[in-house]
């Protein structure tokens, strides 16, 4: 059975350029390794933002990525992307792969549109 991945359709980044959103999959398979990848879609191009593999022991991910962090619990991943600027506004897709044990399954969310608004520069004070 194919896995269904759900993520919110829209998220507004904070004034500090931080966006957080959940990525959930169902049905919940008994899986030892789950790989979660965040992809950004721009026009027809898909680029990898960050990826990590979660296990029963390793529930904190994206340690190799300064701009991504995430925690895994059962079939839900709480994703955080930081360092975002207005030019990073776009559609971010969550891909979930059940890596081990076999069989392999892949599921793709419909994407979360992240809106980033650069903060207004502070006016000079005399």
């Amino acid at each position: 059975e194919a896995i269904q991945v759900t993520q919110p359709s829209v998220v507004l980044a904070s004034s500090h350029g931080v966006a957080s959103f959940p990525c959930e999959y169902s049905p919940s398979h008994n899986t030892d390794e789950v790989r979660v990848t965040v992809l950004r879609q721009t026009n027809d191009q898909m680029t990898e933002v960050c990826a990590t593999t979660f296990t029963e022991k390793n529930t904190v991910g994206f340690l190799d990525y300064p701009f991504c962090s995430g925690t895994f619990n059962e079939s839900r991943v709480n994703l955080t992307i930081q360092g975002l600027r207005a030019v990073d506004t776009g559609l971010y897709l969550c891909k979930v792969e059940l890596m081990y044990p076999p069989p392999y399954f892949v599921g793709m969310g419909n994407g979360t549109q992240i809106y980033v608004i650069d903060p207004e520069p502070c006016p000079d004070s005399d």
């Epitope: 194919a2 898909m46 792969e97 076999p102 069989p103 392999y104 793709m108």
Partner: antibody, heavy 120, light 108 residues
Framework: QVQLVESGGGVVQPGRSLRLSCAAS????????MHWVRQAPGKGLEWVAV????????YYADSVKGRFTISRDNSKNTLYLQMYSLRAEDTAVYYC?????????????WGQGTLVTVSS | EIVLTQSPGTLSLSPGDRATLSCRAS???????LAWYQQKPGQAPRLLIY???SRATGIPDRFSGSGSGTDFTLTISRLEPEDFAVYYC?????????SGPGTKVDIK
């Protein structure tokens, strides 16, 4: 541009072994799952094996399980297929293919193929 | 494993005709995780469609895919001489990754 070049094919007797190689260039090899897909003469496509990004996980088609071993050397950007106990039904063109960024099971780029003939 | 069936086995058409190729999955485990490939004699296959309906990079818009669940279709709106080839569907939602037997589109 993405390029995949297979080598190592040839004529081999039943029961013998052969190792295929696939040299990859034009992309970050270690970020992609890689596959071997074969095509017997005049037949359709048959997926053989996949090795995931870091090389830790490998899956095989039932028809080759226990006889074929897929491996990769990310430092050399090279994919391998070690084939043991070859049978006549393993005769085919063997392609290496890159798994897509959207899903590792999409074969988005292919090599030109290398022919393996198992015959006595 | 998911078994894919393609029909017809051969499609004899003329340049300019519309081609409709069918692919049916034995179970809906593949969801919309279906791809189409084109293969010409002596060449490696080429990815045309993924996600049942998204065109791969560089594929002309006369190629379109549709369907979900168990029934999928590849449509070539107006056949060009270079489109005469064998077309395979493939599911990539779960392992083993399986392909259909192919549909040959040849010149009438």
């Amino acid at each position: 541009q993405v390029q995949l070049v297979e080598s190592g094919g040839g004529v081999v007797q039943p029961g013998r072994s052969l190792r295929l190689s696939c040299a990859a260039s034009g992309f970050t090899f270690s970020s992609y799952g890689m596959h071997w897909v074969r095509q017997a003469p005049g037949k359709g496509l048959e997926w053989v094996a996949v090795i995931w990004y870091d090389g830790n996980n490998k899956y095989y088609a039932d028809s080759v399980k226990g006889r074929f071993t897929i491996s990769r050397d990310n430092s050399k950007n090279t994919l391998y297929l070690q084939m043991y106990s070859l049978r006549a039904e393993d005769t085919a063109v063997y392609y290496c293919a890159r798994g897509g960024i959207l899903a590792a099971g999409i074969f988005d780029y292919w090599g030109q193929g290398t022919l393996v003939t198992v015959s006595s | 494993e998911i078994v894919l069936t393609q029909s017809p086995g051969t499609l004899s058409l003329s340049p300019g005709d519309r081609a409709t190729l069918s692919c049916r999955a034995s179970q809906s485990g593949s969801s919309s995780y279906l791809a189409w490939y084109q293969q010409k004699p002596g060449q490696a296959p080429r990815l045309l469609i993924y996600g049942a309906s998204s065109r791969a990079t560089g594929i002309p818009d006369r190629f379109s895919g549709s369907g979900s669940g168990t029934d999928f279709t590849l449509t070539i709106s107006r056949l060009e001489p270079e489109d005469f080839a064998v077309y395979y569907c493939q599911q990539y939602g779960t392992s083993p990754f399986t392909s259909g037997p192919g549909t040959k589109v040849d010149i009438k």
